[in-house]
């Protein structure tokens, strides 16, 4: 632990002004693991003037950083690049004349306290004012900058011409695209100071390339993958003061695929589990031994999880018997195509026959509408009857 400091497994605090520290505290190689340090508290260190790029990087678990009543004049731009857990920074009463938002833009800070620093009045610090105004909490800090006569001017009363938030404007065509096709997005940015623009495509799978000038840019996405449906694409304008973004959601239309269809499992009900992907939402139709299966309250499709264009569900059967054994085929269909898969279901053996004998499936299904417990509806093949079984439950709601 450095002189003038005390260290524990999770904290470093340096508040003794004599002899004091002249550099950001670093731990000896064989002492406490810096990754476990969550709080660093520094006070009364008039000779501590700089935080270098590599001073804080070892403290990846750091959540609270306090440097107060000290001599801090300069913070390197990438000083906190590796400290993604930082939530509270307090630089009260130091010697900071300027501070860039680039230090903090990647952090999700809940508190940044900068009171009592001799900031120079300039566009460089207007992001702090913008941040303050955006927070609009009752405990706003009284932040000042120094004018040409070295007098304190409240940031709240400061106006800087040609120093404002930028704007981004995304001119997107209809962002509903068929799988495999290509699309080009255009974006224009404006602002003073002139902003930089960049594209934020998140984890886009499809191949993409951008062309960007200062105020105009285009993003071409080729051979669009169905995996990108629902992804957000943003055009971001950024300058000294802050950033603005305009976003669009990509909708990819594609033919259905049944990615999963398994033999029945028994829980509260019997369930033939399936997963279907498709956009627009596919209509589902079940066949039993080659004939349309008209659903009823005893045998029906239930969607349990919808994940954008992927639907996880069951063909749910209430108390099926040997009468329900057979081949179940799921057909998923939308305007871009269809897919089908089949499984064989064996719920129970025929009465009087050993369950393990696995007899042939019956050629005749008894249409015993009075037997509610195993009523699976009319299974004769009436080709003029194709009920719409859109992926909803009986109440018409998606799950």
């Amino acid at each position: 632990c450095p002189t003038s400091c005390k260290c524990s497994a999770s904290r470093i605090w340096c508040s003794d002004p004599s002899p004091g520290i002249v550099a950001f505290p670093r731990l000896e190689p064989n002492s406490v693991d810096p990754e476990n340090i969550t709080e660093i508290f520094i006070a009364n260190q008039k000779r501590l003037e700089i935080i270098n790029e590599d001073d804080v990087e070892a403290y990846v678990g750091l959540r609270n950083l306090t440097i107060v009543d000290s001599g801090l004049k300069f913070v390197a731009h990438k000083a906190f690049l590796k400290n993604s857990n930082l939530q509270h920074i307090n630089f009260t009463r130091n010697k900071l004349t300027s501070l860039s938002r680039k230090h903090f833009r990647h952090l999700d800070l809940s508190e940044l306290i900068l009171v009592g620093n001799p900031f120079t009045c300039s566009c460089d610090i207007m992001w702090i004012k913008t941040l303050q105004e955006a927070k609009s909490s009752p405990d706003t800090q009284d932040l000042y900058c120094l004018n040409e006569s070295s007098k304190n001017i409240p940031l709240a009363n400061l106006q800087i011409p040609n120093c404002g938030l930028p704007s981004a404007n995304l001119a997107a065509p209809n962002l509903t695209v068929e799988e495999g096709k290509s699309i080009t997005l255009s974006c224009s940015v404006a602002g003073d100071p002139v902003p930089n623009m960049y594209w934020d495509v998140g984890n886009l799978v499809s191949k993409h390339m951008n062309e960007t000038s200062h105020t105009q840019g285009s993003l071409r996405i080729t051979n669009i993958s169905s995996d990108d449906s629902g992804k957000q694409i943003s055009c971001v304008a950024e300058n000294l003061v802050g950033e603005d973004q305009d976003s669009v959601n990509l909708t990819v239309h594609f033919a259905p695929t049944i990615t999963f269809l398994e033999s029945p499992t028994s829980d509260h009900h019997w369930c033939i589990p399936f997963t279907v992907k498709g956009n627009p939402k596919p209509a589902l139709q079940w066949f039993y031994n080659g004939a349309i299966l008209n659903e009823s309250k005893y045998i029906c499709t239930k969607i349990h999880v919808t994940n954008h264009t992927e639907y996880h569900g069951c063909l749910q059967l209430d108390n099926p018997t040997h009468m329900n054994n057979g081949d179940y085929t799921l057909i998923a269909k939308n305007e871009y195509g269809k897919d089908e898969k089949q499984i064989s279901a064996h719920f129970m053996g025929w009465p009087g026959i050993d369950d393990g004998a696995n007899p042939n499936y019956p050629d005749v299904i008894y249409e015993d509408y009075g037997t509610a417990a195993n009523d699976i509806g009319d299974t004769t093949n009436r080709s003029n009857e194709i009920p719409s079984t859109d992926v909803t439950d009986k109440t018409g709601r998606e799950h």
């Epitope: 004018n147 040409e148 006569s149 070295s150 007098k151 400061l158 011409p161």
Partner: antibody
């Protein structure tokens, strides 16, 4: 000899706008912070606005913040005060002043009168 | 805001007499940089105000040495050792230490 000459005052209705000008001579205008100070009919003085030497920032008291803007043209040795959403309490004599490097108002113009009345 | 209170409101003096004007601030006006931005201005009848004293006690160029300023913290005084006819007018104190900067209400120096 330092000289500051204001112009542009007049009679304006409440809610109206007006732009005051100040022509400076006798010193290197672009090196000095400039301010506007007003004097009410009751003879009270009130600081109103300040602009830095390069025109890169301005500041105002809360009483005029958001309604007044201040600008300068260093090539023309000119200072401006754009006033909008005027109120009767803005009625005053408006003085253009030079700020010394120490922050005091070391030179004043002769003033221009603004009257806000319906 | 810092309130600057001047007394008296009106000060009748005879030529050659000493005059003293008081200015009291509602809070300490020492700036964080150590300076005290306390100024005195004189507005002669029909004219614009003119700077007399800056930083409590420094005379502006061309101001006669019969004018002197003193004080600290919250209490400040302008003294005119031997009043002359050209000194009549309204005297204003001003603080430029704490934003927003404020003037006192003025003291009218009248010759009796």
């Amino acid at each position: 000899d330092v000289k500051l000459v204001e112009s542009g005052g007049g009679l304006v209705k409440p809610g109206g706008s007006l732009k005051l000008s100040c022509a400076a001579s006798g010193f290197t205008f672009s090196s000095y912070t400039m301010s506007w100070v007003r004097q009410t009919p009751e003879k009270r003085l009130e600081w109103v606005a300040t602009i830095s030497s390069g025109g890169d920032y301005t500041y105002f008291p809360d009483s005029v913040k958001g309604r007044f803007t201040m600008s300068r043209d260093n090539a023309k040795n000119a200072l401006y005060l754009q006033m909008s959403s005027l109120k009767s309490e803005d009625t005053a004599m408006y003085y253009c002043t030079r700020e010394s490097g120490r922050g005091d108002f070391d030179y004043w113009g002769q003033g221009t009168t603004l009257t806000v009345s319906s | 805001d810092v309130l600057m209170t001047q007394t008296p409101l009106s000060l009748p003096v005879s030529l050659g007499d000493q005059a003293s004007i008081s200015c009291r601030s509602s809070q300490n006006i020492v700036h964080s940089n150590g300076n005290t931005y306390l100024e005195w201005y004189l507005q002669k009848p029909g004219q614009s105000p003119n700077l007399l004293i800056y930083n409590v006690s420094n005379r502006f160029s061309g101001v006669p040495d019969r004018f002197s300023g003193s004080g600290s913290g919250t209490d400040f005084t302008l003294k005119i050792s031997r009043v002359e006819a050209e000194d009549l007018g309204v005297y204003y104190c001003f603080q430029g230490s704490h934003f927003p900067w404020t003037f006192g209400g003025g003291t009218k120096l009248e010759i009796t």
